[in-house]
Interface confidence: low
């Protein structure tokens, strides 16, 4: 089934940028849509973005459009989320998720804290 | 490989009448994980390349008249033309894209019954 391992989180000042990465150890990365889902402290889950199998179709939740960029490298089995102009409300655990209509495989998450 | 079998091979229908073309796949092309049927229908007129009509078994490509519809699931599918028009004279193909090794049906020739 494969594991998803995120990295790249940390403490960042508002307005700065961050790049999150996710490596999929499974054998069928290139056959799957992938998503980023985030969860603010003590809050619910919010789907952020997804990308289709070959990287040619991408969707974003309205609140991050223009600031977030999702991409993938199927040769490296890697998913990325580029976050620009960070805001305090972007503070969350960011999960990398396999997105085959339903989200069946989740990473452990990487924490992004946006604070002065 | 997945084999696609269309029926009938040819069909003559009066103008304004309904035309139904069937397509059977040798194994299911319904993906359990996303409940989608990986099936498309194409129309080909003489001297022209095929034109996409329907994908995901029932979703009409933009610009395709609404008299064309697709139905079915699993292994059995149909293309329905609700009211045949003169410009619908063509050969119609189903195609599965369940995996990289996609395959087509053998085609159904649609003519007008006179």
């Amino acid at each position: 089934e494969g594991q998803l391992v995120e990295s790249g989180g940390g403490l960042v000042q508002p307005g700065r940028s961050l790049r999150l990465s996710c490596v999929d150890s499974g054998f069928s990365f290139s056959n799957n849509w992938m998503s980023w889902v985030r969860q603010s402290p003590g809050k619910g889950l919010e789907w952020v973005a997804n990308i289709n199998e070959d990287g040619s179709e991408k969707h974003f939740v309205d609140s991050v459009k223009g600031r977030f960029t999702i991409s993938r490298d199927n040769v490296k089995n890697s998913l990325y989320l580029e976050i620009n102009s960070l805001r305090v409300e972007d503070t969350a655990v960011y999960y990398c998720v396999r997105n085959n209509s339903y989200f069946n495989v989740w990473g452990q998450g990487t924490t992004v804290t946006v604070s002065l | 490989d997945i084999v696609m079998t269309q029926s009938p091979d040819s069909l003559a229908v009066s103008l304004g009448e309904r035309a139904t073309i069937n397509c059977k796949s040798s194994q299911t092309i319904l993906h359990r994980r996303n409940n989608k049927n990986y099936l498309a229908w194409y129309q080909q007129k003489p001297g022209q390349p095929p034109k996409l009509l329907i994908y995901w078994a029932s979703i009409r490509e933009s610009g395709v008249p609404d008299r064309f519809s697709g139905s079915g699931s699993g292994t059995d599918f149909s293309l329905i033309i609700s009211s045949l028009q003169p410009e619908d004279v063509a050969v119609y193909y189903c195609q599965q894209y369940n995996n990289s090794l996609c395959s087509f049906g053998q085609g159904t020739k649609l003519e007008i019954k006179r």
Epitope: S30, E57 | S58
Partner: antibody, heavy 120, light 111 residues
Framework: EVKLVESGGGLVQPGGSLSLSCAAS????????MNWVRQPPGKALEWLAL??????????EYSASLKGRFTISRDNSQSILYLQMNALRAEDSATYYC???????????WGQGTTLTVSS | DIVLTQSPASLAVSLGQRATISCRAS??????????MQWYQQKSGQPPKLLIR???NVESGVPARFSGSGSGTDFSLNIHPVEEDDIAMYFC?????????FGGGTKLEIK
């Protein structure tokens, strides 16, 4: 506007070779899977080969019926798709279409086709 | 966007009893005869885990005490009998239309 223009067809003797080309324009070529599909005169369509996009390392797949005689390739700098055909047979006579594969795996754009006739 | 409303926000159930969590969608999530609604369990400090897909299909490895029901806009997650190990947050999620959306979550506790 998406355009696919095939060339290279013609009359070839059995056992000969030929290379078909397809010039693509109107879209980001490296983002898409590309296919060759053929159609013998009066017959049905037959999928031949695909070459994946940049994200998938431009890997290839072939119909088992070709038995290693055909090779698909792409020139990404010039947006050209190729089909190298060797050991040609009479049954390879057909119109050969260059086809773009949509992200959802169906074929959304087709070229007008180029005709190959294999005959002595 | 499709809005998912979960109820109740929190639920305290005695061990061995039935827990029912509801999820209502602002529009139908039916697609080709399937309900594109999922249920996830999230324990403290862990990522969500898929329990139910397409409204009723229990993911492999999930105990049989978990079941899903519903169609159209109204869905339920049932846990019976509730066990200590089920203390968690539960979320519904639709994959009918982008953007994919989640319910607000239901916190399940033991009475």
């Amino acid at each position: 506007e998406v355009k696919l223009v095939e060339s290279g067809g013609g009359l070839v003797q059995p056992g000969g070779s030929l290379s078909l080309s397809c010039a693509a324009s109107g879209f980001t070529y490296t983002d898409y899977y590309m296919n060759w599909v053929r159609q013998p005169p009066g017959k049905a369509l037959e999928w031949l080969a695909l070459i994946r996009n940049k994200a998938n390392g431009y890997t290839t797949e072939y119909s088992a019926s070709l038995k290693g005689r055909f090779t698909i390739s792409r020139d990404n700098s010039q947006s050209i798709l190729y089909l190298q055909m060797n050991a040609l047979r009479a049954e390879d006579s057909a119109t050969y279409y260059c086809v773009r594969e949509n992200i959802n795996y169906y074929f959304d754009y087709w070229g007008q086709g180029t005709t190959l006739t294999v005959s002595s | 966007d499709i809005v998912l409303t979960q109820s109740p926000a929190s639920l305290a159930v005695s061990l061995g009893q039935r827990a029912t969590i509801s999820c209502r969608a602002s529009e139908s999530v039916e697609y080709f005869g399937a309900s594109l609604m999922q249920w996830y369990q999230q324990k403290s400090g862990q990522p969500p885990k898929l329990l139910i897909r397409a409204a009723t299909n229990v993911e492999s490895g999930v105990p049989a005490r978990f079941s899903g029901s519903g169609s159209g806009t109204d869905f339920s997650l049932n846990i019976h009998p509730v066990e200590e190990d089920d203390i968690a947050m539960y979320f519904c999620q639709q994959s009918r239309k982008v953007p994919w959306t989640f319910g607000g979550g239901t916190k399940l506790e033991i009475k």
